[in-house]
Interface confidence: medium
């Protein structure tokens, strides 16, 4: 989608100072949907736009993480910024029920984890708790303390996959199954994708 | 078309060893997870595990753990499963089936050998 | 592991009826449940995938819908070919399970 990402982040440099530390305080209280988790407020309060555009989508991908900021903007007034994310989310949804086929018509071959593994290591976040999950069954001492020891998250995914190669099937199923209680809507994104 | 073809009916005697067969065609079979499921009469579906015959590796559920023992054999495209120390408990329905697509661990099994029909009595 | 809880366990309809067939997982499973529907003597066959994709081949009248713990099947327009028992499946993570079955006949 690419596109939804960009018309979050256009809005939100869009917004003042005090109009994007108010989008933050409303972010904070809004109604989400179910299974959906918060941005905490510690890390919401001190983000600029590039990296609360980066939150909302790793939080709410971009489908929802789009819908959540219209809603918001709505709230605080700003119809006209809402009404332009509006239109990216009709033509983003045009394109995708353009492109989407159904699964089982497409002989995909490889494993969730070797296809999407750009998208995973840009997109997942909370790392730790993949890892306490592969430590000891998957992931040796050494290679979770090697991960643990990259700064941010792509560096820790990045290392968690040079890992990847020597690892059978029900490995890679084992970091799968990880995902999906941890990102679980980043897993039925990218199974959409 | 895709078509996994079970072997026999088989009647053991507790304490003995069993080994049934699931022959697979109509894809390759190294691309696919088996899985293997059974009934027992009156009961619900329960998984109890698969073999991936592209690497050899298996996951098993932790109650057939020692119970249930998967293999495969790529030159004969069959995939098996040898259950040990029957009890009574053992009588069932087993079944291999495959999923709808490899892509992931979402298993959907959209076909089925015929099962294989296992009953442990003295 | 997650425990799946069909209801009802056996259900009596009568031709062109609606039914729903309810199954409740004992935690999140998000959309990752499937159905499944066995005639006697016969071998599963899957209905329904990701909670509402309908499998190639299988009668519109079938639908299925929910996400997180609660999930229906819902067969609309009953026909004599659908007494079956059926069963729900989470693919949210190992060990598989399934439900304990919902027996369908008709009055």
């Known amino acids: 989608m690419g596109r939804a990402r960009d018309a979050i982040l256009d809005a939100l440099e869009n917004l003042s100072g005090d109009e994007l530390k108010k989008f933050k305080m409303k972010l904070l209280t809004v109604q989400l949907r179910e299974g959906y988790g918060r941005i905490p407020r510690g890390a919401l309060l001190q983000m600029d736009a590039i990296d609360l555009t980066d939150k909302l989508v790793s939080y709410y991908l971009e489908s929802y993480g789009l819908e959540l900021t219209m809603t918001v903007l709505r709230d605080m007034g700003l119809q006209e910024l809402a009404e332009q994310l509006q239109t990216t989310k009709e033509e983003s949804g045009a394109v995708a029920a353009a492109a989407s086929v159904p699964a089982q018509s497409t002989a995909r071959t490889g494993h969730f984890v070797d296809q999407h593994r750009q998208a995973l290591i840009a997109r997942v976040t909370e790392v730790d708790g993949v890892l306490d999950a592969l430590h000891g069954s998957v992931l040796t001492e050494g290679q979770y303390q090697a991960v643990r020891a990259e700064t941010t998250s792509q560096d820790k995914m990045r290392k968690l996959f040079s890992f990847v190669p020597s690892w059978n099937l029900t490995c890679k199923d084992s970091l799968l199954q990880a995902l999906k209680e941890i990102h679980p809507y980043l897993v039925m994104d990218l199974e959409q994708s | 078309q895709v078509q996994l073809q079970q072997s026999d009916a088989e009647l053991v005697k507790p304490g003995a060893s069993v080994k049934i067969s699931c022959k697979i065609s109509?894809?390759?079979?190294?691309?696919?997870?088996i899985h293997w499921m059974n009934q027992r009469p009156e009961q619900g579906l329960e998984w109890i595990g698969y073999i991936y015959p592209g690497d050899g590796s298996a996951m098993y559920n932790e109650k057939f753990r020692g119970k249930a023992t998967l293999t495969a054999d790529k030159s004969s495209s069959t995939a098996y499963m040898q259950l040990n120390s029957l009890t009574s408990e053992d009588s069932a329905v087993y079944f291999c089936?495959?999923?709808?697509?490899?892509?992931?661990?979402?298993?959907?099994?959209?076909?089925w050998g015929q099962g294989t029909l296992v009953t442990v009595s003295a | 592991d997650i425990q799946m809880n069909q209801s009802p366990s056996s259900l009596s309809a009568s031709l062109g009826d609606t039914i729903t067939i309810t199954c409740h997982a004992s935690?999140?499973?998000?959309?990752?449940l499937s159905w499944y529907q066995r005639k006697p003597g016969n071998i599963p066959k899957l209905l329904i995938y990701k909670s509402s994709n309908l499998h190639t081949g299988v009668p519109s009248r079938f639908s299925g819908s929910g996400s997180g713990t609660g999930f229906t099947l819902t067969i609309s327009s009953l026909q004599p070919e659908d007494i079956a028992t059926y069963y729900c499946?989470?693919?949210?993570?190992?060990?598989?399970?399934f439900g304990g079955g919902t027996k369908l006949e008709i009055k």
């Open positions: 935690q999140n499973i998000n959309v990752w």
């Open positions: 089936a495959r999923p709808l697509y490899s892509y992931a661990s979402y298993y959907w099994f959209a076909y």
């Open positions: 109509g894809y390759t079979f190294t691309d696919q997870t």
């Open positions: 499946q989470q693919g949210q993570s190992y060990p598989l399970t």
